[in-house]
């Protein structure tokens, strides 16, 4: 069976029907369907006016405008809001009421595309294997990234989150149109990795998506990850404005100027240094989502009631931090280079800058405890990787799972740890599953390009597709059309159960309480440490316009050091892609299969971004609820700075009015959007037009300042900020 031309809200579209084997099965593939009008720089997306005739949807469209790997030119296009659909078909009738899985790509909110890197003439995010093996519809799409997707002044002039609104437009388009392709509009699952996993999480928390999303899967990234929310967007907006010659004194004039600046110039005005960094990489990526008071109405920690009816899977790779650790400390991948205590202490102190000397020392002590028994270089290097994995991925993911569980009504929660080791031949043998290593298995690459893989890789891929697609069908990864290797139990706050995904899976693959000691450390001990002033913060960053790599703003510290600005002395990004240069490990949108990535892949590992650190953690293991950090009277997470406020305020921590107590057991869910003293604030109505929900009307220039909450009701703790 095949669909032929399909009528959508924009008009007729015609894809390609690809036959699969001799049994008569096939897949209808539609590439490049517009889901919004061509974008205007730094404006909300608008509906597509439609077309006449039949749109031939046979080729991927260009990615959204972004810097190339070398960051000295751009590729992609401003006209980029297109989606792709894979619909599995049986022999006789066209498919009806299939579950729908919408993929959101990663790439640090800085790069990537809905089709992903091209490897052996097979695109990374080609949905065919998932669609045909799992009997689901797969949708991928482009969204704006970098300054064009996320530049914000932190106020109504440039509210930001344009890329998130693009994602929402795609989700809403699918909801309205997918029935015509044989999909069930009431069974939409979002899934994504890294910045895509965080985006999935943010979409479930946004009031705009009420009623659109049934289930969600976050792979190596959640809304609470420390690199996801930019707390000082004005700082970064001014840096770009200065670079392109816009005035920075008045936010309104700056915004108007930025809107009419050549989008390519805006894109190139921002560069991420990838070597010789003074601070960890995560501090240098400035254009990420913001709390705009509208699309993201409050700190994500306070929005989990919005996801109460959405089934959720979240997990990480066991060495997600490896690629970032190896950039922050290149000795990690070099057998002839050593990691010293001094190196590690410096790294730790850079992550814990807002907690000063005590934060650095305590953290260092906790992580180096095993070094006395095992002083081997392998153990030390693993420690560095574990440290970055914990901070950037694992701890935030655990909290997100606990928040989801605590707020869920009927919704189920599942956790996983992906441990199938990386196949990058240049890595040391001890390296486990690196960041983005999971993507190839979810997308069935061991089947699509079998020559690059082993039977055990196909086993892993088959299991992941089975779990993922069963979950999309039923909300339970064990139940559906696909057999699974072992039973995956739900996550609860009592058991903290997670499934370890490896090549050999059985009943012992269900585990409990992952890295409990470190989880407790970050959420209790570290959180309780007093925040220091900028004079006490260590280490001291370089200043001035020296050729030294510029220092980014560091979390909520009161100083905002200078971030990278274009022509800094930062070394160029290692060339990759078609250049014949040595391959760069897969990340975000690359994630290419085992053999070193080639083709147009190989995006260098751009880190997760933002300015914060690992958030506090849920109850774990057998301990019952964790001890509660001291709480002041306020209970409200700090409001991000707006206007010309300069560096971000230090959030209350430790004894100074620390975050409110996390609910445990049966305690009430937090308000949806904290507003004054109300018990629960109503969720604003939805809309996909780029316009905010009513009361604000139109596509309101005004993004209200995020609401604060004066109530003393128990709420989720604010995220730890480094």
């Amino acid at each position: 069976a095949k669909l032929g031309a399909v009528y959508t809200e924009g008009g007729f579209v015609e894809g390609v029907n690809k036959k699969l084997g001799l049994l008569g099965d096939s897949v209808d593939i539609f590439k490049g369907i517009p889901f919004a009008a061509p974008t205007k720089a730094l404006e909300n997306p608008q509906p597509h006016p439609g077309w006449q005739g039949t749109l031939k949807a046979k080729n991927f469209k260009k990615r959204c405008l972004q810097a190339t790997i070398t960051q000295d030119s751009t590729y992609g296009d401003e006209d980029c809001l297109y989606l792709n659909i894979w619909v599995p078909q049986g022999r006789k009738q066209v498919s009806r009421d299939l579950p729908v899985m919408i993929w959101i790509y990663g790439g640090a909110f800085l790069m990537g595309s809905g089709h992903g890197a091209n490897f052996l003439n097979n695109y990374l995010y080609d949905g065919e294997e998932i669609a045909t093996r799992g009997n689901v519809i797969v949708v991928t799409f482009n969204y704006r990234v970098g300054p064009l997707g996320f530049l914000s002044t932190g106020d109504a002039n440039l509210p930001g989150n344009y890329g998130l609104r693009d994602q929402h437009m795609a989700i809403a388009w699918v909801k309205r149109n997918i029935a015509a392709f044989g999909g069930d509009p009431n069974n939409i699952t979002l899934f994504g990795e890294s910045a895509g996993g965080a985006s999935v999480s943010l979409q479930t928390l946004s009031p705009y998506n009420k009623g659109l999303i049934r289930r969600a899967i976050s792979q190596s990234g959640v809304a609470l990850s420390p690199w996801v929310i930019q707390k000082n967007p004005l700082f970064w907006a001014k840096k770009v404005a200065e670079k392109v010659g816009c005035p920075v004194g008045d936010a309104a004039r700056m915004a108007q100027c930025l809107k009419v600046t050549d989008p390519r110039a805006l894109t190139l005005a921002y560069k991420v240094p990838l070597a010789g960094l003074e601070y960890p990489m995560l501090h240098y990526v400035g254009f990420v989502p913001v709390i705009d008071g509208d699309f993201i109405p409050a700190d994500p920690i306070n929005l989990y009631a919005n996801a109460a009816d959405i089934d959720y899977i979240a997990g990480t790779n066991n060495m997600d931090g490896h690629i970032f650790a190896s950039i922050d400390m290149p000795a990690i991948n070099k057998g002839n280079k050593k990691v010293t205590e001094e190196d590690f202490y410096k790294l730790v102190s850079e992550f814990t800058i807002t907690k000063g000397l005590r934060g650095a020392k305590t953290t260092f002590d906790v992580y180096t405890e095993s070094w006395a028994q095992d002083p081997s270089q392998e153990n030390k290097k693993k420690t560095v990787v574990d440290f970055e994995t914990d901070v950037l991925f694992l701890v935030p993911t655990e909290i997100a799972l606990a928040q989801h569980r605590a707020n869920a009504k009927s919704a189920k929660t599942y956790a996983y740890l992906f441990s199938h080791p990386s196949r990058m031949p240049v890595y040391p043998k001890w390296v486990g599953a690196d960041h983005a290593d999971d993507i190839q298995y979810v997308f069935g690459k061991p089947f699509a390009t079998p020559t690059g893989y082993r039977p055990q890789d196909r086993t892993v891929s088959k299991a992941m597709i089975a779990y993922w697609t069963n979950f999309a069908k039923t909300g339970d990864p064990n139940m559906g059309d696909s057999a699974v290797p072992t039973h995956w139990e739900p996550y609860t706050t009592e058991n903290s159960g997670y499934l370890e995904i490896t090549k050999k899976m059985g009943s012992s693959s269900m585990k409990r309480s992952l890295r409990t000691n470190f989880l407790r450390y970050w959420t209790l001990t570290y959180l309780a440490l007093p925040t220091v002033t900028d004079q006490e913060a260590t280490p001291v960053p370089p200043t001035g316009d020296s050729e030294a790599t510029p220092v980014p703003p560091t979390g909520d510290s009161e100083t905002a050091p200078v971030p990278p600005t274009g022509d800094s002395g930062a070394p160029p990004v290692p060339p990759t892609g078609d250049s014949g240069a040595p391959p760069v490990p897969p990340t975000g949108d690359s994630g290419a299969p085992p053999v070193p990535p080639t083709g147009d892949s190989g995006a260098p590992p751009v880190p997760p971004t933002g300015d914060s650190g690992a958030p506090p953690v849920p109850p774990t293991g057998d301990s019952g609820a964790p001890p509660v950090p001291p709480t002041g009277d306020s209970g409200a997470p700090p409001v991000p700075p707006t206007g010309d406020a300069g560096p971000p305020p230090v959030p209350p921590t430790g004894d100074s009015g620390a975050p409110p107590v996390p609910p445990t057991g049966d305690s009430g869910a937090p308000p949806v959007t904290p507003t004054g003293d109300s018990e629960t604030a109503p969720v604003p109505p939805t809309g996909d037009s780029g316009a905010p929900p009513v009361p604000p009307t139109g596509d309101s220039e005004a993004a209200p300042v995020p609401p604060t909450d004066d109530s003393k009701e128990a709420q989720m703790p604010a995220v730890i900020r480094f």
């Epitope: 032929g4 031309a5 399909v6 009528y7 959508t8 809200e9 924009g10 008009g11 007729f12 015609e14 509906p47 597509h48 006016p49 439609g50 077309w51 006449q52 005739g53 039949t54 809403a172 388009w173 909801k175 309205r176 149109n177 029935a179 015509a180 009623g211 659109l212 939805t686 809309g687 996909d688 037009s689």
Partner: antibody
Framework: QVQLVQSGAEVKKPGASVKVSCKAS????????MHWVRQAPGQGLEWIGV????????SYAQKFQGRVTMTRDTSTSTVYMELSSLRSEDTAVYYC????????????WGQGTLVTVSS | DIQMTQSPSSLSASVGDRVTITCRAS?????LNWYQQKPGKAPKLLIY???RLPSGVPSRFSGSGSGTDFTLTISSLQPEDFATYYC????????FGQGTKLEIK
């Protein structure tokens, strides 16, 4: 100027079929989708389906699937809507309507064809 | 399918009055169109894409809204405006509201 001229009123028995025509003029026939909408006496408007005159692609509302067929004749710039297995509740005025631009605002309408289904 | 609900279903007003008709979608939509129909006549496109007027439609007609809530406003009723008004959403299966009959008071 754009004109859509429909065929005359029809009286049909239950179980029969009816074929209504809509002749277009004043624009390039193959450049715009043609929709069919009906209105039962004293009732609101109901979308039946759409045809792309350039390639004959069609899409029908779920309710009419299997009973409606839309075709076109590019040589005469005419579209046809055939509805089979008629029942009394199909008694209505049937309109053809052309897209205004892009998709979906129905900018130009035929005068309507009354189809009466009665035994 | 997306359901469209208009309110009120009928209303009486006088020449010169300002009149507002609302249309609510059961879930978020991208575009909304408004039509005017007089007895025995075919509908006529009045507003498209929520707020845009086709050429020839008087400027006393205006539309607004996004997402799920939309309004049609006639700023100063004229005798020729007494008719039935329909909203319509654009999706892969377009649907109309049930209509609002505007009568002379």
């Amino acid at each position: 100027q754009v004109q859509l001229v429909q065929s005359g009123a029809e009286v049909k028995k239950p179980g029969a079929s009816v074929k209504v025509s809509c002749k277009a003029s004043g624009y390039t026939f193959t450049s715009y989708n043609m929709h069919w909408v009906r209105q039962a006496p004293g009732q609101g408007l109901e979308w039946i389906g759409v045809i792309n005159p350039s390639d004959g692609a069609t899409s029908y509302a779920q309710k009419f699937q299997g009973r409606v067929t839309m075709t076109r004749d590019t040589s005469t710039s005419t579209v046809y809507m055939e509805l089979s297995s008629l029942r009394s509740e199909d008694t209505a005025v049937y309109y053809c309507a052309r897209d205004y631009y892009g998709s979906s605002p129905l900018g130009y309408w035929g005068q309507g064809t009354l189809v009466t289904v009665s035994s | 399918d997306i359901q469209m609900t208009q309110s009120p279903s009928s209303l009486s007003a006088s020449v010169g009055d300002r009149v507002t008709i609302t249309c609510r979608a059961s879930s978020s939509i991208s575009y909304l169109n408004w039509y005017q129909q007089k007895p025995g006549k075919a509908p006529k496109l009045l507003i498209y894409a929520a707020s845009r007027l086709p050429s020839g439609v008087p400027s006393r007609f205006s539309g607004s809204g996004s997402g799920t809530d939309f309004t049609l406003t006639i700023s100063s009723l004229q005798p020729e405006d007494f008719a039935t008004y329909y909203c319509q959403q654009r999706s892969s299966s377009p649907t109309f509201g049930q209509g609002t009959k505007l009568e002379i008071k």
